[in-house]
Structure formats: structure tokens, C-alpha cells
């Protein structure tokens, strides 16, 4: 913490301007009034403060607003945002997308994924839901940031907004996030024709259940291996060889290349070797001929 001293009269600060860059840390602490700083935050980013000086300014604001900064201050943080921790940001209430844009621009090129994720979370909470304007802002200024939201927050996305989400925005989404987004996407695109529907739903398929994957196999979609490999393991394992062949169409030969990667590896182990042989790809590891498969979990449930 900065040690407290009295401000020399000649150093008294009446406005935030460039002269402050010549102040030592202790002089800034003693001479800058926190309320003045907050009122003139829009000037701070234009002044080339050192990181040490920014630490002092942050300390000032922290003292003035122990419960979290008001949005009027947050909007003008500029490079001072780089000094914020996720714990600081958690105290904020942000509703303005202009504020979000300004801070996303500042964070670009800096290792601030935790801070940005917390900021986006606060915006969603502040606005009450993940509306179209928020999604548009995220996709424009922070591709991939959508996936920094928790499944709980993503559940506030109305299906009507899903169309604004681009494939690259979902790149870093995990299975639990896609579990939430997939049903919304299915609803959003339900009135589209087969091929158009597949193009739209493809990025969300990591959250699809087996029944939906089976249904796709009947629609001549020719799913590429990249999409197939993103399907949930639980959705792939129950598929038959015939269903996978229909689902992949001409891409089926890619199974050979991916035979040691999950979920292909796990799916192969569940198939009869005879059935795998019908593909003519030389896939090995299926259940040998004449073997019976006993599902002990089912038997236990019945006993």
C-alpha cells in the first residue's frame, strides 16, 4: 500500500491533466482527490501514466467505491482496466454495451481472459439476459468470448438470438455449454429445409442427443469427420455401422484415419467386426463373430 503523506501546497491537484505524470507515487496518493479522479475519469486514458502510477489511481478508486465502481467510472477506465482483477470486476453492475465494447478493445492483446469472462458475466447479469445486441457485440469485438459464459448464463439466450452466433464463436465452447445451446439452436432453425438446417445446426451438434444424430443420418447430410468427432461420445456409441455410413456418406473413409481417436475408437469397440468389415476400410477392434454382449448394468437394474 502507498504510504500516506501530506500534499505540498504547490502540488495540489485541481484537474486531471498531463502534469500528473511527473508526480511520484506518494505525491499522487496525497494530492489527487478520489472524487475529482472519478469525475474526470474520461481524461485518464489520454495521459501516459506509468503502471505504478495507475496502481495508485486504482487504489484511490477502490477506497472511494469499496462496493464496486459505478458504470460512469467503469466506462472510462481505459488502460486502468488492465489493473483490474476478476474479484474487482465481480462487484460491478454493467448494463451499457458501449462500456463492454470500450473495455473489450482495451483488453485485446493482453492476457485477460479471466477478467473479460467476468466482465461479460456482469453485463449479462446487468441486462437480465443474453440479448441479441449483447451477442452481436461479443461476436464483433470478442470472437470466442461467448464460450466464457457459464451454462447457467447461456441458458438466458432466447432461441431467436441463436442466428447471430457464428461457427467461430462456438470454437471454445465445452460440452456443457453446447448442451444448453443445442436445443435452442434446434428450435431456432426448425423451419429450415434439410440441407440449410444442417449448415446452421452443425456448429451446435456437440450438444446433440443420439436420437437427433440418428435422425440426421436419414437426411443425406454427408457429415464431415471434423463435425462427427465433435459429437458427444454418448451420442455416437449407440449408432449402428449402417447409421454412421449414412451419416458420413463419402466422408466415411475418414474413419480409418481417426480410428485411434475418441469417439471413433470407442464406437469401433462397440460394433460387431462383421459389420465393420462391410465398410471395407480395414477397421479393427470390433466384437468378434459369435460373441454375445451382456449388458450387466441392465441385468443389475432388473434384479
Amino acid at each position: 500500500d502507498v504510504e500516506r503523506t501530506t500534499c505540498p501546497p504547490e502540488k495540489e491537484v485541481h484537474e486531471i491533466d498531463e502534469s500528473l505524470i511527473f508526480y511520484k507515487k506518494r505525491e499522487l496518493e496525497a494530492c489527487v482527490d478520489a472524487a475529482l479522479l472519478a469525475a474526470q475519469m474520461d481524461r485518464v486514458d489520454a495521459i501516459p501514466f506509468t503502471y505504478e502510477q495507475l496502481d495508485v489511481l486504482k487504489h484511490k478508486l477502490d477506497e472511494l467505491y469499496p462496493q464496486g465502481y459505478p458504470e460512469s467510472v467503469i466506462r472510462h477506465l481505459g488502460h486502468l482496466f488492465l489493473k483490474m482483477s476478476p474479484e474487482d470486476i465481480r462487484k460491478w453492475n454493467v448494463t451499457s454495451l458501449e462500456t463492454l465494447k470500450a473495455l473489450l478493445k482495451v483488453s485485446k492483446g493482453h492476457e485477460m481472459s479471466a477478467q473479460v469472462a467476468t466482465l461479460i458475466d456482469r453485463v449479462v447479469v446487468g441486462r437480465g439476459q443474453l440479448d441479441k445486441d449483447t451477442v452481436d457485440t461479443l461476436t464483433a469485438f470478442c470472437p470466442g468470448c461467448l464460450c466464457s459464459l457459464s451454462p447457467e448464463r447461456l441458458s438466458s439466450v432466447p432461441p431467436s438470438v441463436i442466428g447471430a452466433v457464428r461457427p467461430q464463436d462456438l470454437d471454445t465452447c465445452g460440452p456443457r455449454q453446447l448442451d444448453v445451446l443445442y436445443p435452442k439452436a434446434r428450435l431456432a432453425f426448425q423451419n429450415m429445409s434439410g440441407s440449410e438446417y444442417f449448415v446452421k445446426i452443425r456448429p451446435f451438434l456437440g450438444g446433440a442427443p443420439t436420437e437427433d444424430v440418428k435422425a440426421l443420418s436419414q437426411q443425406n447430410v454427408s457429415m464431415d469427420l471434423a463435425t462427427f468427432m465433435k459429437l458427444r461420445r454418448e451420442a455416437v456409441l449407440p449408432l449402428t455401422v449402417a447409421e454412421v455410413q449414412k451419416l458420413l456418406g463419402p466422408h466415411v473413409e475418414g474413419l480409418k484415419v481417426e480410428e485411434q481417436h475418441s469417439p471413433v475408437r470407442d464406437w469401433i469397440l462397440k460394433q460387431r467386426q462383421d459389420d465393420l468389415d462391410t465398410l471395407g476400410l480395414g477397421l479393427q477392434g470390433g466384437i468378434p463373430n459369435g460373441y454375445l454382449i451382456l449388458d450387466l448394468s441392465v441385468r443389475e437394474a432388473l434384479s
Epitope: D224, L225, A226, M229
Partner: antibody, heavy 119, light 108 residues
Framework: EVQLQQSGPELVKPGASVKIPCKAS????????MDWVKQSHGKGLEWIGD????????IYNQKFNGKATLTVDKSSSTAYMELRSLTSEDTAVYYC????????????WGTGTTVTVSS | QIVLTQSPAIMSASPGEKVTLTCSAS???????LCWYRQKPGSSPELWIY???NLASGVPARFSGSGSGTSYSLTISSMEAEDAASYFC?????????FGGGTKLGMK
């Protein structure tokens, strides 16, 4: 433009480890596996292994089991290869290369990182 | 593992000459799963031919590829100066993926 950017040359001591980054840009990171290849004067090109960025699922050439560890960071579209217990035999150029999932050819190669092991 | 043997290891050709590089596999390779890379000194390898006979983007039409089973080849119908480089064959029909030792092609 599709690019795989690797770090500069590394000079390391025997027994040490090195972690080589490969930063991908210009394409959907999760649609491609990332493979790693060693090129040395004595042995030509050798496939080390690959990683699926969706599942972090890895496959290694048995020869490099215990020598190489492949990881990815989806949030930054970066793949990494860590080489440990280095000996002079590990002196080589190491390339990352992308492979469209479902194919086996490497359509884009990284810039290469030269690793020199010397005391 | 499948061993790929390339021949010749080193060769040079005159401008306009037809050049054939061969790649022999120790056991059968599915033709879809064989490709060729070109590498110039000081540069990374680049995909040249995939699935035995398909030219990668930007590869001149004077190049062609053919073969099946254990025998594959890359042919240049009319050698040009810019074709001087090392060429490697590569299979992914079986794990581990393997490469040929390369043919270093020079200009006479």
C-alpha cells in the same frame, strides 16, 4: 491466411525439457488435428504424434512415448509439444502441421523450431 | 510399421527432361492414404500431391502422381529450375504414420 507460427531456436542442456508453442490462425482450430513431425539429419522426417483439439485426445508414435507430450489451449488456438529428458539425439527441427480431421495429409506446416541439445 | 523407401536418394535433371521419383512401401498402402511433400532448403515442407494423384493447390500441372499397393511414383513431365527441391512420400494407412527418406532433386 492460414498460418502456424512456431517459436525461435532453442539451445538446451542435456536432461532438460523444452516446450514448443504453435500458434494457429486463419482457420477453425477445432476442425483440424495438430500433428508434430521431427526432422533430423540422420533420420529424415519422423511423425511424433497428433492431438485432437476438441477432446485433447492424443496418439503418439511409440518411439516418442515418454519423450513428447502434446497439449492444446483452445482459447488461444495454440498447440504445444513438450520434450523432456533431452539428449543429443533430440537435436532436430520440430514442425507442427495441421491435418483436417478425417484425412491424413498435412496441408499446412508450421515455421519449424530448431532444438539444439548441447552442454 | 510401414517403411517407405524412396529412390533415387539424389538425382539431377536437365531443363525439359522428364523426371520420375519412386516410393516403395514395405507392405500395401491404400492409395487414398499416400501423399507427397516438397521441401526447399531452409523452408518447411509443403503438401504437393495427396491421395496418390491429386495435386495440392498451386502445384503446376507438369506434376503428376500414380501408383497402388506397394509402388508409388511422382512424375515431372518437363523439369524446370524451380522444381529443384527434396520430395518426400508419406503414408497414413497404418500407425505410426511414416515418411520416405526423400529424394533430393537438383538441376543439371
Amino acid at each position: 491466411e492460414v498460418q502456424l507460427q512456431q517459436s525461435g531456436p532453442e539451445l538446451v542442456k542435456p536432461g532438460a525439457s523444452v516446450k514448443i508453442p504453435c500458434k494457429a490462425s486463419g482457420y477453425t482450430f477445432t476442425d483440424y488435428n495438430m500433428d508434430w513431425v521431427k526432422q533430423s539429419h540422420g533420420k529424415g522426417l519422423e511423425w511424433i504424434g497428433d492431438i485432437n483439439p476438441n477432446t485433447d485426445d492424443t496418439i503418439y508414435n511409440q518411439k516418442f512415448n515418454g519423450k513428447a507430450t502434446l497439449t492444446v489451449d483452445k482459447s488461444s488456438s495454440t498447440a504445444y509439444m513438450e520434450l523432456r529428458s533431452l539428449t543429443s539425439e533430440d537435436t532436430a527441427v520440430y514442425y507442427c502441421s495441421r491435418r483436417l480431421i478425417g484425412t491424413g495429409y498435412f496441408d499446412v506446416w508450421g515455421t519449424g523450431t530448431t532444438v539444439t541439445v548441447s552442454s | 510399421q510401414i517403411v517407405l523407401t524412396q529412390s533415387p536418394a539424389i538425382m539431377s535433371a536437365s531443363p525439359g527432361e522428364k523426371v520420375t521419383l519412386t516410393c516403395s512401401a514395405s507392405s500395401s498402402v491404400i492409395s487414398t492414404y499416400l501423399c507427397w511433400y516438397r521441401q526447399k532448403p531452409g523452408s518447411s515442407p509443403e503438401l504437393w500431391i495427396y491421395s496418390t494423384s491429386n495435386l495440392a493447390s498451386g502445384v503446376p500441372a507438369r506434376f503428376s502422381g500414380s501408383g497402388s499397393g506397394t509402388s508409388y511414383s511422382l512424375t515431372i513431365s518437363s523439369m524446370e529450375a524451380e522444381d529443384a527441391a527434396s520430395y518426400f512420400c508419406h503414408q497414413w494407412s497404418n500407425y505410426p504414420y511414416t515418411f520416405g527418406g526423400g529424394t533430393k532433386l537438383g538441376m543439371k
